[in-house]
């Protein structure tokens, strides 16, 4: 009778074990062990027992002790079970961002590990077990589906293997995968709201505002604002679940035409976009052209108004005939026209909107000088010793210089309060002079003495 000890062994992969082969007869013809494993016999006294060291045990094996005794041959097997923890325990890669309400499939792959009968795969969210299954196949795969909730944001999912050798008197060996941190998000189906001018004039600035509600987590939302190829740099203000992005937009002549204004909100691996067209236009103020801005009285003056080719103009409230970008009027310059404003108003339709521009020019009419009876009376009679102010107003453009002299030397103090004396009496020659010429007028001052009353 052949016996073996131990009859069952569990050992780590690559490990060694001592196996004793014994026989019940005292003088066996043969006593040995049959195994493909490297073996080393340990010398012992006696013939009916042999001890072997079996080394580098890589896989389950069944070495067989045999003996040949006078009453026949017999064998006994020992069962070597090799254990080892899995080589790789991994969660299949997933996008880190997942939309709330979506089903997320977690897949754990386990490579190797033995004995498989004692190996379990556990899928976890934090410390909470989601699924537990025996490891089957190579690689062993365990999957579970999770309905993504808002409160899963930041949760760590992992996969753990448990090689439970406690029933064999060993321990529980655990291997855990690298965690997968879930980032959940909500991006509403509604596109962002975009508020901007529909038309924008070249070399001006406009303000664009893009906003959206119902985002989670709002702080992770990226906002991209662009006008054509020009990226705008918005200032973003966040609410609880909303944001508002405000940007200034400057346009130049190169941007003229219809441009696409885009607001894109990116959250997780999704985006929402709103497109709007902005018409960039160039509309200089109309040009008011006077034949000459300064003319002499009686001169014929042409006033022209010219605007953008597509504009319609009115000159001093009178529409161009025919309606279009040009208008003109003719006049003979009179002193009353001096300082007269000629106003041209141009209207341009841009993307359904009417844009108005005005330009005003003033006409200067050169006339005079003039000395009229109304403004410079020819006769003054004042009582002696009374307080009087001699008034004589010369008219003209440019305003004439006025001097009133008696005998070529004695001035009449025009516009000044004086005490009337006998010396003031006499005839004065008032001379008004400007670049336009000069005029004279005689003014007589009579002084009434009290003795004549």
């Amino acid at each position: 009778q052949t016996s073996v000890s131990p009859s069952k062994v569990i050992l780590p992969r690559g490990g060694s074990v001592l196996v004793t082969c014994s026989t019940s007869c005292d003088q066996p013809k043969l006593l040995g062990i049959e195994t493909p494993l490297p073996k080393k016999e340990l010398l012992l006294p006696g013939n009916n027992r042999k001890v072997y060291e079996l080394s580098n045990v890589q896989e389950d094996s069944q070495p067989m002790c045999y003996s040949n005794c006078p009453d026949g041959q017999s064998t006994a097997k020992t069962f070597l079970t090799v254990y080892w923890t899995p080589e790789r325990v991994e969660l299949a890669p997933l996008p880190s961002w997942q939309p709330v309400g979506k089903n997320l499939t977690l897949r754990c792959q386990v490579e190797g590990g033995a004995p498989r009968a004692n190996l379990t795969v556990v899928l976890l969210r934090g410390e909470k077990e989601l699924k537990r299954e025996p490891a089957v196949g190579e690689p062993a795969e365990v999957t579970t589906t999770v309905l993504v909730r808002r409160d899963h944001h930041g949760a760590n999912f992992s996969c753990r293997t448990e090689l439970d050798l406690r029933p064999q008197g060993l321990e529980l060996f655990e291997n855990t995968s690298a965690p997968y941190q879930l980032q959940t998000f909500v991006l509403p189906a509604t596109p962002p709201q975009l508020v901007s001018p529909r038309v924008l004039e070249v070399d001006t600035q406009g303000t664009v505002v893009c906003s959206l509600d119902g985002l989670f987590p709002v702080s992770e939302a990226q906002v991209h604002l662009a006008l054509g190829d020009q990226r705008l740099n918005p200032t973003v203000t966040y609410g609880n679940d909303s944001f508002s992005a405000k940007a200034s937009v400057s346009v130049t002549a190169e941007d003229e035409g219809t441009q696409r204004l885009t607001c894109a909100v990116i959250l997780g691996n999704q985006s929402q976009e709103t497109l709007q067209t902005v018409t960039i236009y160039s509309f200089p103020a109309p040009n008011v052209i006077l034949t000459k801005p300064e003319v002499s009285e009686g001169t014929e003056v042409t006033v022209k108004c010219e605007a953008h080719p597509r504009a319609k103009v009115t000159l001093n409230g009178v529409p161009a005939q025919p309606l279009g970008p040009r208008a003109q009027l003719l006049l003979k310059a009179t002193p009353e026209d001096n300082g007269r404003s000629f106003s041209c108003s141009a209207t341009l339709e841009v993307a359904g909107q009417l844009i108005h521009k005005n330009q005003t020019r003033e006409l200067r009419v050169l006339y005079g000088p003039r000395l009229d009876e109304r403004d410079c009376p020819g006769n003054w009679t004042w009582p002696e010793n009374s307080q009087q102010t001699p008034m004589c107003q010369a008219w003209g453009n440019p305003l004439p210089e006025l001097k009133c002299l008696k005998d070529g030397t004695f001035p009449l103090p025009i516009g000044e309060s004086v005490t009337v004396t006998r010396d003031l009496e006499g005839t004065y020659l008032c001379r008004a002079r400007s670049t336009q010429g000069e005029v004279t007028r005689k003014v007589t001052v009579n002084v009434l003495s009290p003795r004549y009353e």
Epitope: E87, E111, G112, E141
Partner: antibody, heavy 120, light 112 residues
């Protein structure tokens, strides 16, 4: 004892396809994956792909993607490697090898090899 | 792809003497779990490769203890303490850390 026995040598014309089999025995078939490796004359060994004998999942070397297909018949404990659009550079000895799916413990048992000659 | 460079290409050795083969990787072979999946194979003439060492230093079943592996990161060595006649053949290193898996060019061991 573990054995991987491959189908016999093949001679093919350029543009044709070849399908090589690998019959496994001596172990629990679905406990190990099967890999395919080739050795062209004067070239280093080249890993082609792997199949999970349990699930049928595969992974291929990008170099062969689109030309190589690895399949498994669990009931026959046999894996197959088909290579299409053959060219002269595909002349090589093709091996199947047993391992873990990601090969972490090395390819512990190999088939005897199948010689493929591609010639017009 | 990861390139494994073996040196020497050929190594003539006297029976009973030690032999050493080097394998250098173009990038680290340490996987994210801390393990290094570098293996050694021997291919005798007309035969398929045979696994000698797995994971840098673990001898496979039935491999004599005169074979040992060492190294870390990118530099690895296979040593034979006393060369025997049956050790003649081409030795390959191989990596299963990075996809696709690759092999070294081989080192031919021959007896002087």
């Amino acid at each position: 004892q573990v054995q991987l026995v491959q189908s016999g040598a093949e001679v093919k014309k350029p543009g044709a396809s070849v399908k090589i089999s690998c019959k496994a025995s001596g172990y629990t078939f679905t406990d190990y994956a099967l890999h395919w490796v080739r050795q062209a004359p004067g070239q280093r060994l080249e890993w082609m792909g792997v199949i999970s004998t349990y699930s049928g999942n595969t992974d291929y070397n990008q170099k062969f993607r689109g030309r190589v297909t690895i399949t498994v018949d669990k009931s026959a404990t046999t894996a197959y490697m088909e290579l299409s659009s053959l060219r002269s550079e595909d002349t090589a000895v093709y091996y199947c090898a047993r391992s873990l799916y990601f090969g972490s413990s090395g390819f512990d048992y190999w088939g005897q090899g199948t010689a493929l000659t591609v010639s017009s | 792809d990861v390139v494994l460079t073996q040196t020497p290409l050929s190594s003539p050795v006297t029976l009973g003497q030690p032999a050493s083969i080097s394998c250098r990787s173009s990038q680290t072979l340490v996987y994210r779990n801390g393990n290094t999946y570098l293996h050694w194979y021997l291919q005798r003439a007309g035969q398929p490769p045979r696994l000698l060492i797995y994971k840098v230093s673990n001898r496979f079943s039935g491999v004599p203890d005169r074979f040992s592996g060492s190294g870390a990161g990118t530099d690895f060595t296979l040593k034979i303490s006393r060369v025997e006649a049956e050790d003649v053949g081409v030795y390959f290193c191989s990596q299963n850390t990075h996809f696709p898996y690759t092999f070294g060019g081989g080192t031919k061991l021959e007896i002087k």
